[in-house]
Interface confidence: medium
């Protein structure tokens, strides 16, 4: 039965962890806005994309930027459900 | 292209502005990063104002640093100068993507002297 | 507060030897790898010759190789030229929201 305890324990730290990880990785991507070279919110006297990746080194830009998009997305509903859970959860007490 | 203009000899307590002015690129999509370094000291990282006009500080700077732009300029503000902040201040361009980040844009820096 | 060590303070170096500097960390960088290294001449600003820990910036000589991740991290220049004469220094960016220059060295070419 303490094995079990301490198992729950464990899982239980673990996700706050990964919680208070996930929190720390949005809030340091926010921070940072848009990479300049991804060309995210770029206005109409940025350089295009070609022009910034002249030198070739990321010819997949605009996946990685996606990717980006995607990490950003997934961190924030992730964090934003967890959110409203918890005010769900104070509102049941 | 980057470059920082306002440097001057001041004395201890009176506010100083720098600027950074910038051109090629556009401060709506960059990040800017002010470093800087004393005489013949090693560079320290002073903090950068993001592409959304938020701003960022080092740890030991929050407070007596503070950073603003318009569409073209970057300027860093020092509230209250001491001796310990005579230095010279490079403006640099804040790259980043999720796999890397880089300053890859360097102005040639101007100096600030805090005196009495 | 994070601390990144550079190794050695200065190093001396002949032409056409090697030289490879250390830089340690006492937190990972953010993605373990958000580490740069930048060349500075006196009187110049510092050049970014490596981001990324091993990208290549434009313009550089191949000759100059970064290696390493997460906490540890190398700057490696093979066949050292006279005009390599320089201070070096890393530069670690974290999750913290922070960046931080390691101390530098000193690289004298004979």
């Known amino acids: 039965r303490r094995d079990v305890a301490h198992g729950i324990l464990n899982e239980a730290y673990r996700k706050v962890l990964d919680q208070l990880s996930a929190g720390k990785h949005l809030q340091s991507l926010v921070a940072r806005g848009v990479g300049g070279s991804l060309g995210g919110g770029a206005g109409d006297d940025a350089e295009p994309l070609s022009k910034r990746h002249s030198d070739g080194i990321f010819t997949d830009s605009y996946s990685r930027y996606r990717k980006q998009m995607a990490v950003k997305k997934y961190l924030a509903a992730v964090l934003g459900k967890r959110y409203k859970q918890r005010v769900k959860n104070k509102g049941r007490r | 292209s980057v470059e920082e203009s306002g440097g001057r000899l001041v004395t201890p307590g009176t506010p100083l502005t720098l600027t950074c002015t910038v051109s090629g690129f556009s401060l709506s999509t960059y990040n800017m990063c002010w470093v800087r370094q004393a005489p013949g000291k090693g560079l320290e990282w002073v903090g950068f104002?993001?592409?959304?006009?938020s701003a960022y500080y080092a740890s030991w700077a929050k407070g007596r640093f503070t950073f603003s732009k318009t569409s073209t300029t970057v300027d860093l503000k020092i509230a209250s100068p001491t001796t310990e902040d005579t230095a010279t201040y490079f403006c640099a361009r804040y790259d980043w993507d999720y796999y890397y980040s880089r300053l890859d844009l360097w102005g040639p820096g101007t100096l600030v002297t805090v005196s009495s | 507060d994070i601390v990144l060590t550079q190794t050695p303070a200065s190093v001396s170096a002949a032409v056409g030897g090697t030289v490879s500097i250390s830089c340690q960390s006492s937190e990972s960088v953010y993605n373990n790898n958000y580490l740069s290294w930048f060349q500075q001449k006196p009187g110049q600003p510092p050049k970014l010759l490596i981001y990324g820990a091993s990208t290549l910036a434009s313009g550089v000589p191949s000759r100059f190789e970064g290696s390493g991740s997460g906490t540890q991290f190398t700057l490696t220049i093979s066949d050292v030229q006279c005009d390599d004469a320089a201070t070096y220094y890393c530069l670690g960016d974290y999750i913290i929201i922070e960046n931080i220059f390691g101390g530098g060295t000193e690289v004298v070419v004979k």
């Open positions: 104002i993001n592409s959304d006009d």
